[in-house]
Amino acid sequence: DAHKSEVAHRFKDLGEENFKALVLIAFAQYLQQCPFEDHVKLVNEVTEFAKTCVADESAENCDKSLHTLFGDKLCTVATLRETYGEMADCCAKQEPERNECFLQHKDDNPNLPRLVRPEVDVMCTAFHDNEETFLKKYLYEIARRHPYFYAPELLFFAKRYKAAFTECCQAADKAACLLPKLDELRDEGKASSAKQRLKCASLQKFGERAFKAWAVARLSQRFPKAEFAEVSKLVTDLTKVHTECCHGDLLECADDRADLAKYICENQDSISSKLKECCEKPLLEKSHCIAEVENDEMPADLPSLAADFVESKDVCKNYAEAKDVFLGMFLYEYARRHPDYSVVLLLRLAKTYETTLEKCCAAADPHECYAKVFDEFKPLVEEPQNLIKQNCELFEQLGEYKFQNALLVRYTKKVPQVSTPTLVEVSRNLGKVGSKCCKHPEAKRMPCAEDYLSVVLNQLCVLHEKTPVSDRVTKCCTESLVNRRPCFSALEVDETYVPKEFNAETFTFHADICTLSEKERQIKKQTALVELVKHKPKATKEQLKAVMDDFAAFVEKCCKADDKETCFAEEGKKLVAASQAALGL
């Protein structure tokens, strides 16, 4: 339904608090380098303008699109060119090209300082002094570092952030109360950001059809009792929500997400028996809860799939009449029967089915041609099953840190041109699949592991896209969304790689390593491991293990020494010499 003033419509729907928060998120995701107070000022100006439009929808400029209003506001920033360079050229464009231009300049790895957590007392004082500004700063800092963070979900995180400070700043032991909650929010936030980044990549790089296929498979697993028409309606609405958020239309996205949650709860009887608790919660919690809800039980006595999709003589007729609808029904029927499969596997099966029908429906005897199509699925199903079994065994044998190291070596040998920080970050995250998924029973392992790996490999893809250095990464990232993981798994050692020159500075360590947290210390060691492999890509596992064991002993010894810095200098030289000898450098 058309509104005279879009900005007034969204202000009224969302309320002032959510409106301001979402505009702040939008602005911080576009202009990631601007200081906090500049954004606050711009948001306040937009909010005041929105209020005039609520009072009189016919007032000047109230009929303008949100992109026009927001874009005009962003283009008033005086230092646009000196801070953002060519992004300033966006302001010479008209909508919708201007917004597309801003979107293209979003930076997945902005050059921003690491967020350092102040002392608990300092945070509590700041929270009590100015709660509203404290929470705005949280939204701003997360949004600018995660320019595709799912905005309505970030409001949910902010609500939990506020609740943590409200509770813990009154506690006897503030730190014991607050720090675990902040750690949990940080870890969940990173995971949420990465999951949303994959959704946006899916929409932006592979199109709406790819996203809809993903959504059909996932929602059919989650809501196996729902009819195909119901799932299709949910998929259409969900696609609209994510298209809006990924496109920077955060007010529309949040509004439509609230409408979708309302619809789901009003129709839960025909969707899922697992929604009752979610639907009793307030809006932000409700939407989050629905997004994370467990799979409903499969209906009893579902007929064999073969009847409709292989044995029926109408397969080609039904396919020809409405290809995407028929393939959607196949995906729905297969997914609701297989909560034990990853979404990407289900999509590979659907693609195989589609390719077979394309070929066979043009053949002399279509039925004869596609009669054995389900046999083609067997190796596709077994490949991830075997891979997960092998890797979970390795994880259980090694533990998380050493499992990460094994993956670091594996991926550095596959794509040694990728920057060391990216290889460390991605391999560490790949390694987390062990503790995240291997504890699950067989029936839950594959959806947990392979769909998580899709999220992590997408991080590699978006970081690599910013500074492409490897044709192999580009190939795996761009050829097929659902085959990214098999593509990376299939990569062998890059024989064309010319080993990096040895640089002793890379392997020089100082006493500051002793004061680092265990995680930071691991990252230092893993960085050194990647550099070792880049110097000596043909090094064996045994050689690398020996060097890493020596390195760990060296750090431990020098951190216990009285004169730590001297120890690091002297013992470090010996270690480098011994490592070079061991690896034949």
Epitope: D38, K41, V77, E82, K137
Partner: nanobody, 123 residues
């Protein structure tokens, strides 16, 4: 409540130096830019220098190379070191909290003001 108090003004000879201080009470410098403004007799108030919450600095052309803005987050202090002072720098200097918006300061971008401190450059 946001409160700003300036100090450090006085009488100085041309070519001399002064260091103005601004203490910020009731808020944290993490959330605001602090700007220094001045108003000479019979003239409009003008932006002199500005420092953002993340430490970026801006200066009016007339003071570039002579004035330096800095801050001490722990003490909630912002300083304006003024060197090579000229008679035309004579004015009441105010500090204010708000947003630099990428410049040395526009009054409209600042919501909270101090009372001001007099700087006189004369031989």
């Amino acid at each position: 409540e946001v409160q700003l108090v300036e100090s450090g003004g006085g009488l100085v000879q041309p070519g001399g130096s002064l260091r103005l201080s601004c203490v910020a009470a009731g808020f944290t410098l993490d959330y605001y830019a602090i700007g220094w403004f001045r108003q000479a007799p019979g003239k409009e108030r003008e932006g002199v220098s500005c420092i953002t919450s993340d430490g970026r600095t801006y200066y009016a052309d007339s003071v570039k190379g002579r004035f330096t803005i800095s801050r001490d987050m722990a003490k909630k202090m912002v300083y304006l070191q003024m060197n090579s002072l000229k008679p035309e720098d004579t004015a009441v200097y105010y500090c204010a909290a708000g947003a630099c918006m990428g410049g040395s300061g526009y009054e409209a971008d600042f919501g909270s003001w101090g009372q001001g401190t007099q700087v006189t450059v004369s031989s």
